[in-house]
């Protein structure tokens, strides 16, 4: 494949990554699948710089990111190490709260209205952000 050199239409470039901000809501798994179909992934936040950029563009709205603990430990969807990486949880979070009455705990992370993170029920229909790296090879076949 060829290396992507600029962001697709309606995506926003920042620090060699491209971001797409949804305007509707989906469950975490549906949002995750949407990004994958776009040859991207749910946003992986690795620094304050990236946090601030995403936080401004989503506004004060609950928004899914690419972080979950559905299989036990917290994991970023692109394999970025969670334990040593950037974190911006709200106080007392994540708490895997079971009191919501929807069954199970809370396994998916989202940005809250002030930008800090919370874990919530993965079925909630929140907005989401896709991210893809500009330097990664696209899946399109090369032009002959």
């Amino acid at each position: 494949g060829s290396e992507r050199t600029c962001c697709p239409v309606n995506w926003v470039e920042h620090e060699r990554s491209c971001y797409w901000f949804s305007r509707s809501g989906k469950a975490w798994a549906d949002a995750d699948n949407y990004c994958r179909l776009e040859d991207a992934h749910l946003v992986v936040v690795t620094s304050w710089e990236e946090q601030k950029f995403v936080q401004h563009h989503i506004g004060p709205v609950n928004t899914w990111m690419g972080l979950h603990d559905q299989n036990g430990p917290w994991k970023w969807v692109d394999g970025t190490d969670y334990e040593t990486g950037f974190k911006n949880w709200r106080p007392e979070q994540p708490d895997d709260w079971y009191g919501h009455g929807l069954g199970g705990g809370e396994d998916c992370a989202h940005f809250t209205d002030d930008g800090r993170w919370n874990d919530d029920v993965c079925q909630r229909p929140y907005r989401w952000v896709c991210e893809t790296e500009l330097d990664k090879a696209s899946q399109e076949p090369p032009l002959l």
């Epitope: 239409v9 309606n10 920042h14 797409w20 305007r23 601030k52 950029f53 401004h56 930008g115």
Partner: antibody
Framework: QITLKESGPTLVKPTQTLTLTCTFS??????????VGWIRQPPGKALEWLAL???????RYSPSLKSRLTITKDTSKNQVVLTMTNMDPVDTATYYC??????????WGQGTLVTVSS | SYELTQPPSVSVSPGQTASITCSGD??????VCWYQQKPGQSPVLVIY???KRPSGIPERFSGSNSGNTATLTISGTQAMDEADYYC????????FGGGTKLTVL
């Protein structure tokens, strides 16, 4: 080259509605990450942010003025319109529109002075 | 509502370093921009995303942002740098500081 120009009345009466138009060139308001914002500056005072609109129709307003403001865009005309209701003499200011990219007001118009007086 | 505080005035001798501060609660968690405004002119962006310089802005302008304070630093200050400077914080919305008048003595 990016340019922006504000237009509208220079004098409005108290309680009237102000309508300002920002006409721009050199960028498209359909490009991801791009927006246009409005800022005002009373004579001899500080800048005050009013409102902004992004490529994806996301609108943001100053909390203290939100009930009085409406921002709209017309991408075919390369224009952004700000309306402000119930004008008062304290709203007398130079009103600027500005081009937003990379989370910053990167380019500004020349500004238009609006006086509110009976 | 969120507020940014700047000193009303800062004085500096030509060739010296001027530092203008901007303070706000957890300001380091937000992007900060700095604008220069000369009398009768529109503001000009000099720093964005805390520390980036737009093309055409001299290297003597630099920015930093951590904790509760952002700082605009002008090294080797020149007479032409005399102006009002405004900080601006971006969160879900945005807000300006009250401005600082920089005087080059």
């Amino acid at each position: 080259q990016i340019t922006l120009k504000e237009s509208g009345p220079t004098l409005v009466k108290p309680t009237q509605t102000l309508t300002l138009t920002c006409t721009f060139s050199g960028f498209s308001l359909t490009t991801g990450g791009v927006g246009v914002g409005w800022i005002r500056q009373p004579p001899g005072k500080a800048l005050e942010w009013l409102a902004l609109i992004y490529w994806n129709d996301d609108e943001r307003y100053s909390p203290s003025l939100k009930s009085r403001l409406t921002i709209t865009k017309d991408t075919s005309k390369n224009q952004v319109v700000l309306t402000m209701t119930n004008m008062d003499p304290v709203d007398t200011a130079t009103y600027y529109c500005a081009h937003i990219i990379a989370v910053a007001f990167q380019h500004w118009g020349q500004g238009t002075l609006v006086t509110v007086s009976s | 509502s969120y507020e940014l505080t700047q000193p009303p005035s800062v004085s500096v001798s030509p060739g010296q370093t001027a530092s203008i501060t901007c303070s706000g609660d957890k300001l380091g968690h937000k992007f900060v921009c700095w604008y220069q405004q000369k009398p009768g002119q529109s503001p000009v962006l000099v720093i964005y995303q805390d520390r980036k310089r737009p093309s055409g802005i001299p290297e003597r302008f630099s920015g930093s942002n951590s904790g509760n304070t952002a700082t605009l630093t002008i090294s080797g200050t020149q007479a032409m740098d005399e102006a009002d400077y405004y900080c601006q914080a971006w969160d879900s919305s945005t807000v300006f500081g009250g401005g600082t008048k920089l005087t080059v003595l």
